[in-house]
Amino acid sequence: AESCTSRPHITVVEGEPFYLKHCSCSLAHEIETTTKSWYKSSGSQEHVELNPRSSSRIALHDCVLEFWPVELNDTGSYFFQMKNYTQKWKLNVIRRNKHSCFTERQVTSKIVEVKKFFQITCENSYYQTLVNSTSLYKNCKKLLLENNKNPTIKKNAEFEDQGYYSCVHFLHHNGKLFNITKTFNITIVEDRSNIVPVLLGPKLNHVAVELGKNVRLNCSALLNEEDVIYWMFGEENGSDPNIHEEKEMRIMTPEGKWHASKVLRIENIGESNLNVLYNCTVASTGGTDTKSFILVRKADMADIPGHVFTR
């Protein structure tokens, strides 16, 4: 699984070496005599068989279709066929960012706590034998490190370590120089010891509604990664087909905490939805916090002081 291209949808950056490796490779070695074919289709083009003659950038090995390099016009569907085995990939080649040493779409980010040990290592197992040298860049400035085969950073984090780290592998193929880039975004935060989770906004919310209309009740909280946020309403949750809990959305704060929101959607509001409590709770090992929403008919608004209304 770690050695073949298992994903059916792949996005790559133009100008880099790239390969597709089918997942029945061990099988292919057993049946050397079997005809093995690679095809491409894109747009109006039907299956076109690929071979080194079809492009000087393409190389075919036992299990692998290599691109030297992959270009925008390589976007399309690729097929490997051998006897009754077929594997298909959809390849999307995106533009390189000409103004940076990396393309934002290809970045993976991690949070590191200040003073904690962290590391960056530059490795590429597939092209390992072809790599002449590897450089590590921070925010597109080359770092001077001893090892130019597998440059590594291992240290206790300081705030100045925050940034984009790009491993650039330089390799030769058929007399040409290529490079492959992998970029990591490191964010340094204060230590992430747990906070007491808190729901945002007033504890009691009267919401003015009209019968037959829909309403969305938004419950937001600041919480820890393992804390949960949920809605409680009525005798039995889920007994009203007009009430739907939407998928929880989470965004990480710069401090490594989470801002979560969960919407309760009430459709075709009826009398039974009025003047009852819809409770939103955030729960953690340190306790719970609850806020309540009450739906009030718009006509009855005059009976309630204005300051208790939410939009």
Partner: nanobody, 120 residues
Framework: EVQLVESGGGLVQPGGSLRLSCAAS????????MGWYRQAPGGKCELVST????????YYADSVKGRFTISRDNSKNTLYLQMNSLRAEDTAVYYC?????????????WGQGTLVTVSS
């Protein structure tokens, strides 16, 4: 851009269990195959387990087969590694990684990770 945070490591006795979590944010979690790497003190970076986004098919290194279980909850944008029957040789820093190719060939031991120590 996907952002990953590992947690759940700790000290456990041989034979014990731990569950590691990796919370993802900032991008569509289900666009990525997810996996766990580990690096023992002074050792090399080793791919432990992966799970694909399309059919949730899994891979396990021989050293953890039958003891570790990888899973993902796309609704919570979270990856898990349930580790049972832990051994001293499982002691390592464990790193979560997202892969948009499915080739797992570019080394995943980076960041802070979460330390798992198996000792009596």
């Amino acid at each position: 851009e996907v952002q990953l945070v590992e947690s759940g490591g700790g000290l456990v006795q041989p034979g014990g269990s731990l569950r590691l979590s990796c919370a993802a944010s900032g991008s569509t979690f289900d666009e990525y195959d997810m996996g766990w790497y580990r690096q023992a003190p002074g050792g090399k970076c080793e791919l432990v387990s992966t799970i694909s986004t399309i059919d949730a098919s899994t891979y396990y290194a021989d050293s953890v087969k039958g003891r570790f279980t990888i899973s993902r909850d796309n609704s919570k944008n979270t990856l898990y590694l349930q580790m049972n029957s832990l051994r001293a040789e499982d002691t390592a820093v464990y790193y979560c990684e997202a892969d948009d190719r499915g080739t797992w060939d570019r080394g995943g031991c980076w960041g802070q990770g979460t330390l798992v120590t198996v000792s009596s």
